[in-house]
């Protein structure tokens, strides 16, 4: 078998709304993956997991089952939606989030995915980990890639 | 319907500490958050802090710091208070209030029955 | 901290005759999205505090409509029209805004 190449594309769009009062910051955060069969032949994409991270805590998770097919030598581009909640302990960014003196309130998260694909019985994980920049302070439309955080020191290969 | 019972009244002497608990029914525990509120003989009230039973975490008013340790036991669905090194001015009814509502539509909708301290050597 | 302003510590009113108690706020409790986090408690001799108004003109359930609450983002007025004799105890307004969540002194209604 050939590989299934899984490319983490960005961030496509981040909502954004605010519990006032509990200090808590919902984002509804929509990504990107592109998915690239170099088979001869179909393969399921079964499911994907993604998680996202703030400052070392997991602030959102989200599974997607049963997704699609992507028959041979095809590419399906994927968007899957993580709910995040930045509450409790990082209530702190919520003043930062909201505060009106500055235009643009971007936060380093780090988006983790696993995609399992399957063909003939058998199963494959890919995973892949991004830092991405995303806006607290209002609803964002991204340009594909515009998100990233190139300026985080990636661990040596 | 949606309750909150409340220890009973409680007599501690001067530097000791007391726990109060506060039991709920009629609705999810896990689902609100549980505050505690303090009056004085007389007086007004005061907010102590809260509990979100669901992940333990609390937030306490910077007054009661170091006197008030807010817990809760989601398999009894009861909210506790511990008061620590107790002095006469801990003397007082404490109540522990429901957080109803929804999102940036909270209040104090449900009160408990209220816990008397008395510190007295 | 929000300090929390009742001027009366008592109103003497006169059953069946309408009555209005007022509170300040040290800070606006107007939110840019439009709520403003005032509330108001009434608790009756020996009783625990039971909610009134919530989001300063809301009615909270089961509160006869003869409650009702108004005012700008620092000043409040908790109306009672028809007074009963039921309705005597201590108001306490209260803001749940920011943390320390604070209340007012109190005001007593008294029946003349």
């Known amino acids: 078998p050939r590989s299934i190449d899984v490319k983490y594309i960005g961030v496509k769009s981040a909502y954004v709304s605010y519990d006032v009062q509990k200090r808590t910051i919902y984002l509804n955060i929509t990504n990107t993956l592109n998915i690239t069969n170099n088979n001869y032949y179909s393969v399921e994409v079964e499911n994907i997991t993604a998680q996202v991270q703030f400052s070392k805590t997991v602030i959102g998770k989200a599974r997607l089952n049963n997704i699609t097919i992507i028959g041979p030598l095809d590419m399906k581009q994927i968007d899957y939606t993580v709910p995040t909640v930045i509450a409790e302990e990082m209530s702190y960014m919520y003043d930062f989030c909201t505060l009106i003196s500055i235009k643009v309130h971007n936060i380093v998260l780090m988006m983790q995915v696993t995609v399992t694909t399957t063909y003939f019985g058998h199963s494959e994980q890919i995973s892949q980990e991004r830092y991405q920049y995303v806006d607290c302070g209002r609803n964002t439309t991204y340009q594909l890639g515009q998100s990233e955080y190139l300026n985080v020191l990636q661990p040596q290969q | 319907q949606v309750q909150l019972q409340q220890s009973g009244a409680e007599l501690a002497k001067p530097g000791a500490s007391v726990k109060l608990s506060c039991k709920a029914s009629?609705?999810?525990?896990?689902?609100?958050?549980m505050h505690w509120v303090k009056q004085r003989p007389g007086q007004g009230l005061e907010w102590i802090g809260y509990?979100?039973?669901?992940?333990?975490?609390?937030k306490n008013n910077q007054k009661f710091k170091d006197k008030a340790t807010l817990t809760a036991d989601k398999s009894s669905s009861t909210a506790y208070m511990q008061l620590s090194s107790l002095t006469y001015e801990d003397s007082a009814v404490y109540y522990c209030?429901?957080?109803?509502?929804?999102?940036?539509?909270?209040?104090?909708?449900?009160w408990g029955t209220g816990t008397t301290v008395t510190v007295s050597s | 901290d929000i300090v929390m302003t009742q001027a009366a510590p008592s109103v003497p009113v006169t059953p069946g005759e309408s009555v209005s108690i007022s509170c300040r706020s040290s800070?606006?409790?107007?939110?840019?999205?439009?709520?403003?986090?005032s509330y108001w408690f009434l608790q009756r001799p020996g009783q625990s505090p039971q909610l009134l108004i919530y989001?300063?003109?809301n009615l909270a359930s089961g509160v006869p409509d003869r409650f009702s609450g108004s005012g700008s983002g620092t000043a409040f007025t908790l109306r009672i029209s028809r007074v009963e004799a039921e309705d005597v105890g201590v108001y306490y307004c209260?803001?749940?805004?920011?943390?320390?969540?604070?209340f007012g002194g109190g005001t007593k209604l008294e029946i003349k």
């Open positions: 209030a429901r957080e109803g509502g929804s999102i940036s539509d909270w209040y104090f909708d449900v």
């Open positions: 009629g609705y999810t525990f896990i689902s609100y958050w």
């Open positions: 509990v979100n039973p669901s992940s333990g975490y609390t």
């Open positions: 800070k606006s409790l107007l939110h840019s999205n439009g709520n403003t986090y």
């Open positions: 989001r300063m003109s």
């Open positions: 209260m803001q749940h805004l920011e943390y320390p969540y604070t």
